[in-house]
């Protein structure tokens, strides 16, 4: 089941997602210029079996003044290895959910491709929030947002991250004004909610990150 | 000359339901994804509703899923959005909009959206 909506936005903050969920597709988009080849995809999806999980489906741009052209999508090795650095790398990142049935990769880059990645998330996706550059994290708790169903609906957890500039001065994390919940109102009045404990994940998390993975541009 | 025109909004009461239409020409729409969007006095635009022209993607806004349905006759080269037990909270502005990729959904997604027509007023009095 697809997410209804995309991830919440939190100031100054971008997210990451470290792998994704079976059934994650990922829109076949290209830069100026250029368009998807004719009857080419227009989404990669991430399937597999108990044992391993990889992206159906290739993207190909063609430039659009020549549509007889296309443009292939097979990686260099050197394109692999240089996404690679893009994973977090820190001893405090959650375990590496790429590693885990179910879960594809970051798919490599394809020619041409648009400067954003545009994924369609499935119920049980987790992103990983980090503050921009030039601003640091105050923490009531995990920076990660997880996509659940409830009642028959999608909503993602709020992530318990403010990013702040660094010469504004600011209150303790605990003196901070709770952050509206998705629907605009706090989860304590959302009564058929479901709560559930993710893995915890240390505060100083979003400090430490590898900063790479937040600074590509595919977010 | 790229046209998407809106067609069928208007006053209704809450509970009601309106369907509103959007003629494209200039364009097919059999290779464009067509989406809606809405954008409510005062505040920002806000997505609600995407369909890609293959029918692999079809994205709803949390807040109208289950309630709205959007469709499209490619044939007539025409998209629509069929709004059932509308509330007041869903009065606003609704726009048409296409792209040549595939579906985009959420916030950020305004954009992305190659083409966008001049909107319905739709309104819900409770």
């Known amino acids: 089941e697809l997410c209804d909506d995309d991830p919440p936005e939190i100031p100054h903050a971008t997210f990451k997602a470290m792998a994704y969920k079976e059934g994650t597709m990922l829109n076949c988009e290209c830069k100026r210029g250029f368009r998807r080849i004719k009857s080419g995809s227009l989404y990669m999806l991430c399937t597999g079996n108990s044992s391993h999980s990889s992206w159906d489906n290739q993207c190909q741009c063609t430039s659009s003044a020549t549509r007889n052209t296309t443009k292939q999508v097979t990686p260099q090795p050197e394109e692999q290895k240089e996404r690679k650095t893009t994973e977090m790398q820190s001893p405090m990142q959650p375990v590496d959910q790429a590693s885990l049935p179910g879960h594809c990769r970051e798919p490599p880059p394809w020619e041409n491709e648009a400067t954003e990645r545009i994924y369609h998330f499935v119920v049980g996706q987790m992103v990983y929030y980090q503050c921009v550059q030039g601003y640091r994290a105050l923490h009531r708790g995990p920076a990660e947002s997880v996509c659940k169903m409830t009642h028959g609906k999608t909503r993602w957890t709020q992530p318990q991250l403010i990013c702040t500039g660094e010469m504004e001065t600011s209150q303790f994390p605990g003196e901070e004004k709770p952050q509206a919940s998705p629907e605009g109102r706090p989860e304590s009045e959302t009564s058929c909610l479901v709560t559930t404990t993710d893995f915890q994940i240390q505060t100083e998390m979003a400090a430490t990150m590898e900063t790479s993975i937040f600074t590509t541009e595919y977010q | 000359e790229v046209q998407l025109v809106e067609s069928g909004g208007g006053l209704v009461q809450a509970g009601g339901s309106l369907r509103l239409s959007c003629a494209a020409s200039?364009?097919?729409?059999?290779?464009?994804?067509m989406a809606w969007f809405r954008q409510a006095p005062g505040k920002e635009r806000e997505f609600v509703a995407a369909?890609?022209?293959?029918?692999?993607?079809?994205r709803y806004a949390s807040s109208v899923k289950g309630r709205f349905t959007i469709s499209r006759d490619n044939a007539g080269n025409t998209g629509f959005l069929q709004m059932n037990s509308l509330r007041p909270e869903d009065t606003a502005v609704y726009y048409c909009?296409?792209?040549?990729?595939?579906?985009?959904?959420?916030?950020?997604?305004?954009?992305?959206?190659?083409?966008w027509g001049q909107g319905t007023q739709v309104t819900v009095s409770s």
């Open positions: 909009a296409a792209r040549e990729g595939g579906v985009v959904a959420g916030v950020r997604s305004g954009a992305p959206y190659d083409y």
């Open positions: 200039g364009i097919t729409f059999n290779d464009h994804t």
């Open positions: 369909r890609d022209w293959s029918d692999i993607i079809t």
